[in-house]
């Protein structure tokens, strides 16, 4: 099951966000999160993940995309894209599973 | 300290929504190490898991309540919210925030029981 | 969905007796996301043990969890009368999160 978290050998990571403690982290997964906000411009934040992989399964929308990779610093270059507005019917930020 | 605040009606009727707001203190709840969960006890009952929501918005929600139930998140107020709609009396419970990290649920809210009733 | 079943549904002890709670997996879990409870009447659960065997800040240390795969235990060596409550354990990091049913250790 890819989505059963576990504590098996830790991967180093680049951690660029306001919560990072320093330029790396260490954690099961590396992670990238674009997330735009209403009125804001999109932030991108890198760094660790431990639980809840199925965050990496979701799909893209408007307003968040998450990126997992499992390499040592694999997260460094990576740049992500929101999706294109969707139509009012949809909803966005939709339960992922 | 990381405290954590439920609030909103105690009492809902049958059909309607049930809203309450966790208020979250003593940490930011845009951290990406948390998890921000709700969970119900109905009376004399276990504990059921409702959803979580991650501080970009994704949410994650019980299958069994997954067409009812909406998770919000307001990270400049550092509060999510619980949307639980055409509730009836097996929804009344007390409803919990809680914190969820790699060590668990580490921290909760005291809970605030909401009835359902005309 | 993982079904966590514990037993018994109560126990009573008297203190100073050693308390073992079982919980058992429907399928092999990761022992890393296995989580431990104890709720008293009219309060919110408190985290007593996470990642099967490692305690939360503050809990004594007569408290201590075990297991792995499909069987967890949490086990109190010597009762104190503040440890007589409902216990609950828990699998967490991975959607759905789940809660076994609850062990009620009562006074004998």
């Known amino acids: 099951d890819p989505v059963k978290p576990s504590r098996g050998p830790l991967v180093t990571c680049t951690c660029e966000s306001p919560h990072c403690k320093g330029p790396t982290c260490r954690g099961a997964w590396c992670t990238v999160v674009l997330v735009r906000e209403e009125g804001r411009h999109p932030q991108e934040h890198r760094g660790c993940g431990n639980l809840h992989r199925e965050l990496c399964r979701g799909r893209p929308t408007e307003f968040v995309n998450h990126y997992c990779c499992d390499s040592h610093l694999c997260n460094h270059n990576v740049s992500l894209v929101l999706e294109a507005t969707q139509p009012p019917s949809e909803q966005p930020g939709t339960d992922g599973q | 300290q990381v405290q954590l605040q439920e609030s909103g009606p105690g009492l809902v009727k049958p059909s309607q929504t049930l809203s309450l707001t966790c208020t979250v203190s003593?940490?930011?709840?845009?951290?990406?190490?948390?998890?921000w969960n709700w969970i119900r006890q109905h009376p004399g009952k276990g504990l059921e898991w409702i959803g979580y929501?991650?501080?970009?918005?994704?949410?994650y929600y019980n299958p069994s309540l997954k067409s009812r139930v909406t998770i919000s998140v307001d990270t400049s107020k550092n509060q999510f919210s619980l949307k639980l709609s055409s509730v009836t009396a097996a929804d009344t419970a007390v409803y919990y925030c809680?914190?969820?990290?790699?060590?668990?649920?580490?921290?909760w809210g005291q809970g605030t029981l909401v009835t359902v009733s005309s | 969905e993982i079904v966590l079943t514990q037993s018994p549904g109560t126990l009573s002890l008297s203190p100073g007796e050693r308390a073992t709670l079982s919980c058992r997996a429907s399928q092999s879990v990761s022992s890393s996301y296995l989580a431990w409870y104890q709720q008293k009447p009219g309060q919110a659960p408190r985290l007593l043990i996470y990642g099967t065997s490692s305690r939360a800040t503050g809990i004594p240390d007569r408290f201590s969890g075990s297991g792995s795969g499909t069987d967890f235990t949490l086990t109190i060596s010597r009762l104190e009368p503040e440890d007589f409550a409902v216990y609950y354990c828990q699998v967490y990091g991975s959607v759905p999160i789940t809660f076994g049913q609850g062990t009620r250790l009562e006074i004998k």
């Open positions: 809680a914190r969820e990290s790699v060590a668990g649920f580490d921290y």
């Open positions: 929501i991650y501080y970009s918005g994704s949410t």
């Open positions: 003593g940490g930011s709840i845009s951290s990406g190490e948390y998890y």
